[in-house]
Amino acid sequence: QKSSIEKCSVDIQQSRNKTTERPGLLNCPIYWQQLREKCLLFSHTVNPWNNSLADCSTKESSLLLIRDKDELIHTQNLIRDKAILFWIGLNFSLSEKNWKWINGSFLNSNDLEIRGDAKENSCISISQTSVYSEYCSTEIRWICQKELTPVRNKVYPDS
């Protein structure tokens, strides 16, 4: 039995997969910040986690997925104040009793040191210094991401 948040996450992910392929993104859109091979949009308003998830989807993006500790630190360096929390694309899967990214993968326990409980209706937020488990109904800011397409040198056959 999936929770409403899990269903919402799966539905949005599936609808994104059904959309037609778009040409790769070479530059970040206006208001988006480039961080390595990603474009990030830090919201100025607040929402519960599932509304944040939906908002990113409407922007043809996803809630932030963090690959490793290094990416976490670089993202946190972009947060201007210690009293701002941002939702990312990670929440507790009740059915699998584990932290699950919105792309379907599970959290590697070494990647993030989460402060707080792993339980139903818990979603993950980040601040300037830490990673927190908060109730998914809490209204805080959120971070959307778009992947930049790496530019590859074209190799032409000898003429």
Partner: antibody, heavy 119, light 107 residues
Framework: EVQLVESGGGLVQPGGSLRLSCAAS????????MSWVRQAPGKGLEWVSA????????YYADSAKGRFTISRDNSKNTLYLQMNSLRAEDTAVYYC????????????WGQGTLVTVSS | DIQMTQSPSSLSASVGDRVTITCRAS??????LNWYQQEPGKAPKLLIY???SLQSGVPSRFSGSGSGTDFTLTISSLQPEDFATYYC?????????FGQGTKVEIK
């Protein structure tokens, strides 16, 4: 109806300790950051401390750092402020308020509890 | 820390008057500015958040404007229950700071 009710104030000697409580009702307490704000007699408002909905994240005004500790018990819908090493300048009405993480405004306030630090 | 400066510190007005209170931040705070009303012996009450949004249940005679460093609270037609002290507050960065207050008294 949202209600915040503070208690625990009183007269304490300099260097003493006091624990304030704020009982919350009428909303999902665990989903909101909470703050303490104080007002010295005849003076303006001063933010003291805030805590996230889960209680995992806290922060303080410089005047409270190292002496005051904010905490919460979500199972009891209660916010706390443990105040140690109290000084005369801590004399004030202490309010608990809903909100405290940027960009929250304080949309609901308790009636306040008076803390008097005097020998 | 961001300093918030209100003016005037106090003013005298009559019922029906249009009253304007200003608040200046020591640096840009975008629109992260709130206004509160405090009657004597009572807790503050939120009037305006995000510089210009009226809090639910607050009469429409109250309005807010401004962004960056300069903000204004306007009471279009002062009522007897509006005689109180008004505070601005920034929620742009920590520590959260308030203006020193503006006391609105009966002329």
């Amino acid at each position: 109806e949202v209600q915040l009710v503070e208690s625990g104030g009183g007269l304490v000697q300099p260097g003493g300790s006091l624990r304030l409580s704020c009982a919350a009702s009428g909303f999902t307490f665990s989903s909101y950051a909470m703050s303490w704000v104080r007002q010295a007699p005849g003076k303006g408002l001063e933010w003291v401390s805030a805590i996230s909905g889960s209680g995992g994240s806290t922060y303080y005004a410089d005047s409270a750092k190292g002496r005051f500790t904010i905490s919460r018990d979500n199972s009891k819908n209660t916010l706390y402020l443990q105040m140690n090493s109290l000084r005369a300048e801590d004399t004030a009405v202490y309010y608990c308020a809903r909100g405290g993480y940027l960009p929250d405004a304080f949309d609901y306030w308790g009636q306040g509890t008076l803390v008097t630090v005097s020998s | 820390d961001i300093q918030m400066t209100q003016s005037p510190s106090s003013l005298s007005a009559s019922v029906g008057d249009r009253v304007t209170i200003t608040c200046r931040a020591s640096q840009s705070i975008s629109s992260y500015l709130n206004w509160y009303q405090q009657e004597p012996g009572k807790a503050p009450k939120l009037l305006i958040y995000a510089a210009s949004s009226l809090q639910s249940g607050v009469p429409s005679r109250f309005s807010g404007s401004g962004s960056g460093t300069d903000f204004t609270l306007t009471i279009s037609s002062l009522q007897p229950e509006d005689f109180a002290t008004y505070y601005c507050q920034q929620t742009y960065s920590t520590p959260l700071t308030f203006g020193q207050g503006t006391k609105v008294e009966i002329k």
